[in-house]
């Protein structure tokens, strides 16, 4: 018979933060291994160190862990315009960043691709570009925002959205046309 | 509340097309940028796609460009993904996303199986 785990032997079972249970005697808590390290050998008994050992060149370990390899190092995607801000280290994985006056737009949570801030040539900058947002540009009269830049109302065709903000523009070419064809 | 529906994947032989569509409600499409991401059996979402929000830029992950184009209709609150000269790495589940936002948001996606 499999004798049935009380609460207390369940608590006793549960180890102190920095330790974890050994995967083939759940009576020993091992030490974690620190951030850099990765686990080689669990710790033979209790009170008996783990075995840890150094990440190797190009993997890392950011805290402190068991795990039985280290972390392969991130590049950065050149083609998305990355750059890199500081080098993989055994503690601390590669940080990828974008240029100065660029930020970044993320097509998924850990992808990210490096887009040059807009200028707001003809409007002015109602935001400043951030690390992770586009300046946010106030077109001048005449003008509408398209893809984030100021575009003359002469390219504002009825179908598009700006037709409101182009109201007059519209109008005026309208006439025009009409005018042409009498 | 944000609604993402895939639909068009199924089963093609390698060198097939499909053209997948996701239909957007609850956000205001015509102002986000939208992705496309796909996760194969076993393997980690990886990106496929992308359109700014009028559909002037589009951008594509080395593995799909030349095959793949990404469009999209405002009026419809829709977007695409047509996929010609189908191989079997590109065998996966398909999501659409609006992208640049936190990803909170998925679909149930649609499948795409390439085989002979």
């Known amino acids: 018979l499999v004798p049935h785990l009380g609460d207390r032997e369940k608590r006793d079972s549960v180890c102190p933060q920095g330790k974890y249970i050994h995967p083939q005697n759940n009576s020993i808590c091992c030490t974690k291994c620190h951030k850099g390290t990765y686990l080689y050998n669990d710790c033979p008994g209790p009170g008996q160190d783990t075995d840890c050992r150094e990440c190797e060149s190009g993997s890392f370990t950011a805290s402190e862990n068991h795990l039985r390899h280290c972390l392969s190092c991130s590049k950065c995607r050149k083609e998305m315009g990355q750059v890199e801000i500081s080098s993989c280290t055994v503690d601390r994985d590669t940080v990828c960043g974008c240029r100065k006056n660029q930020y970044r737009h993320y097509w998924s949570e850990n992808l990210f691709q490096c887009f040059n801030c807009s200028l707001c040539l003809n409007g002015t900058v109602h935001l400043s570009c951030q690390e992770k947002q586009n300046t946010v540009c106030t077109c001048h009269a005449g003008f509408f925002l398209r893809e984030n830049e100021c575009v003359s109302c002469s390219n504002c065709k009825k179908s598009l959205e700006c037709t409101k903000l182009c109201l007059p523009q519209i109008e005026n070419v309208k006439g025009t046309e009409d005018s042409g064809t009498t | 509340e944000v609604q993402l529906l895939e639909s068009g994947g199924g089963l093609v032989q390698p060198g097939g097309s499909l053209r997948l569509s996701c239909a957007a409600s609850?956000?205001?499409?015509?102002?986000?940028?939208m992705t496309w991401v796909r996760q194969a059996p076993g393997k980690g979402l990886e990106w496929v796609s992308g359109?700014?929000?009028?559909?002037?830029?589009?951008y594509y992950a080395d593995s799909v460009k030349g095959r793949f184009t990404i469009s999209r209709d405002n009026s419809k609150n829709t977007l695409y993904l047509q996929m010609n000269s189908l191989r079997a790495e590109d065998a996966a589940v398909y999501y659409c996303?609006?992208?640049?936002?936190?990803?909170?948001?998925w679909g149930q996606g649609t499948l795409v199986t390439v085989s002979s």
């Open positions: 359109i700014a929000a009028y559909g002037i830029s589009t």
């Open positions: 609850g956000f205001t499409f015509g102002d986000d940028w």
């Open positions: 996303a609006e992208s640049g936002k936190v990803f909170d948001y």
